[in-house]
């Protein structure tokens, strides 16, 4: 991760003291089940959850160095329908593979301005950011 | 949301200027598909994704006022196996309903101390926090 300037530092405080990114060793924030190679519409009998699912998905990286987390991953469904539990390799049109969305809290860095309008380092702006977490096998909606 | 003290404020800066929580109107951070009432092991034909899934789940609130986000939701599977696509109510033992986990970036507030050890407001400490996002229908692992 690139090191961001301090969060509007006050005199004599190093930015590390103000907003400690690195208190916990932080690996790249990719899902444990990240697998870019499983691109076929099948449910594997081993491997990570996204490849064993009957609504399998892959992950797509979304990197923004002015955002925290800088790396987010979006799920992308590999099949329109669910894969049969009998074989794991042919589709069952009675089920749809649908994306599960979530509004995640993220922070964007932007310039902080003092009372006189002068630049005073960076502030963090909290935002909700829509990410797709996974693909889920659902029964199709019955329209009333 | 309760208002947190500033991120180690420098003289003359209001905390709102330093770390703007409220730039975007922020509703409670609950998933769009939140449903505490769907506690039966069945796949509905309407309603939110977590109740239409053949691996249905409910959400459990995890609130911590010293963390951002203060409210997180953990998925809890309602069935050990997947629900049949045919009936939406019988279980199909050929599929397991498994939790999908994710290490989410969160921030904890804690006292900031100056060089002389005196209290200087609050700092944010970045952490990874394990949350369960959803339940996914998977084919059981084949042991080699």
């Amino acid at each position: 991760y690139s090191h961001w300037p301090s969060c509007c530092p006050s005199k004599g405080y190093p930015s590390e003291e103000l907003l400690r990114w690195s208190t916990v060793p932080v690996p790249p924030l990719k899902p444990a089940s990240l697998d870019f190679h499983s691109v076929s519409c099948r449910a594997s009998e081993d491997g990570p959850l996204n490849s064993r699912a009957i609504s399998p998905w892959r992950y797509e990286l979304d990197r923004d160095l002015n955002r925290l987390p800088q790396d987010l991953y979006h799920a992308r469904c590999l099949c329109p329908h669910c894969v049969s539990l009998q074989t794991g390799s042919h589709m069952d049109p009675r089920g749809n593979s649908e994306l599960l969305y979530h509004n995640q809290t993220v922070f964007y860095r932007r310039p902080c301005h003092g009372k006189k309008g002068n630049h005073k380092g960076y502030c963090l702006e909290r935002r909700l950011y829509r990410v797709s977490l996974a693909c889920v096998c659902v029964r199709p909606r019955v329209m009333g | 949301y309760s208002h947190w003290p500033s991120c180690c404020p420098s003289k003359g800066y209001p905390s709102e200027e330093l770390l703007r929580w409220s730039t975007v109107p922020v509703p409670p951070l609950k998933p769009a598909s939140l449903d505490f009432h769907s506690v039966s092991c069945r796949a509905s034909e309407d309603g939110p994704l977590n109740s239409r899934a053949i691996s249905p789940w409910r959400y459990e609130l995890d609130r911590d006022l010293n963390r951002l986000p203060q409210d997180l939701y953990h998925a809890r599977c309602l069935c050990p196996h997947c629900v049949s696509l045919q009936t939406g109510s019988h279980m199909d033992p050929r599929g397991n309903s498994e939790l999908l986990y994710h290490n989410q970036t969160v921030f904890y507030r804690r006292p900031c101390h100056g060089k002389k050890g005196n209290h200087k407001g609050y700092c944010l400490e970045r952490r990874l926090y394990r949350v369960s996002l959803a339940c996914v229908c998977v084919r059981p692992r084949v042991m080699g």
Epitope: C41, R42, S84, L85, Q86, T87, G88, S89, H90, M91, D92, P93, R94 | S84, Q86, T87, S89, H90, M91, D92, P93, R94
Partner: antibody, heavy 123, light 113 residues
Framework: QVQLQESGPGLVKSSETLSLTCTVS????????WSWIRQPPGKGLEWIGF???????NYNPSLKSRVTFSVDTSKNHFSLKLNSVTATDTAVYYC?????????????????WGQGTLVTVSS | DIVMTQSPDSLAVSLGERATINCKSS????????????LTWYQQKPGQPPKLLIY???IRESGVPDRFSGSGSGTDFTLTISSLQAEDVALYFC?????????FGPGTKVDIK
């Protein structure tokens, strides 16, 4: 009436690749699932895997690392390749069609079989 | 994998008598949502490929004589030949198609006593 016919060499050297083709007549290869099954002399049946006309495959985990299926819809045939063969791969190899249940969207039993071809692996 | 076992390994029955073959699966192959047992029976005569007799545990394939019947549910299944004929001398296999890999029983040899 659907008929299946296996073809390929009856003798394969150890460590080499066994190659067989199944030709379907009296019906289209499309819209069905097609399997390979083998039977060592005097023994039981072992399912090797299936292929769909689209090329989607499913292999028995016990043979997955050595087996490859392919399909040619224009010639109405599908093929099996089994590499690094040993004497234990000596068997009668059958191709067969899966019954498909359109109500459950699942594969049923094997309703049509080829006559089978004996493949012997020699050292 | 689901393991299929058959008993007996072989049996000899007089012409016109009943022959019973048992098949057991290592796990349940009944799907409650459809109330179907994913089990089939095949007959194999020497030098020939297997021939489909029974599917969904009890449904007779068209053209199969009605002396052949299948029964059972869950993990225990039976093929019955109510009145054995000379042409019924063969090897009989059960097979599950509940989940891949599809697996066969070892076979039961039926002879005339």
């Amino acid at each position: 009436q659907v008929q299946l016919q296996e073809s390929g060499p009856g003798l394969v050297k150890s460590s080499e690749t066994l190659s067989l083709t199944c030709t379907v007549s009296g019906g289209s290869i499309s819209s069905y699932y097609w399997s390979w099954i083998r039977q060592p002399p005097g023994k039981g049946l072992e399912w090797i895997g299936f292929i769909y006309y689209s090329g989607s495959t499913n292999y028995n985990p016990s043979l997955k690392s050595r087996v490859t299926f392919s399909v040619d819809t224009s010639k109405n045939h599908f093929s099996l390749k089994l590499n690094s063969v040993t004497a234990t791969d000596t068997a009668v190899y059958y191709c067969a069609r899966h019954y498909f249940d359109s109500g459950t969207y699942e594969l049923g039993p094997f309703d049509y079989w080829g006559q089978g071809t004996l493949v012997t692996v020699s050292s | 994998d689901i393991v299929m076992t058959q008993s007996p390994d072989s049996l000899a029955v007089s012409l016109g008598e009943r022959a019973t073959i048992n098949c057991k699966s290592s796990q349940n192959i009944l799907l409650t949502s459809s109330n179907k047992n994913y089990l089939t029976w095949y007959q194999q005569k020497p030098g020939q490929p297997p021939k489909l007799l029974i599917y969904w545990a009890s449904i007779r394939e068209s053209g199969v004589p009605d002396r052949f019947s299948g029964s059972g549910s869950g993990t225990d299944f039976t093929l019955t030949i109510s009145s054995l004929q000379a042409e019924d001398v063969a090897l009989y296999f059960c097979q599950q198609y509940y989940i891949t890999p599809f697996t066969f029983g070892p076979g039961t040899k039926v002879d005339i006593k």
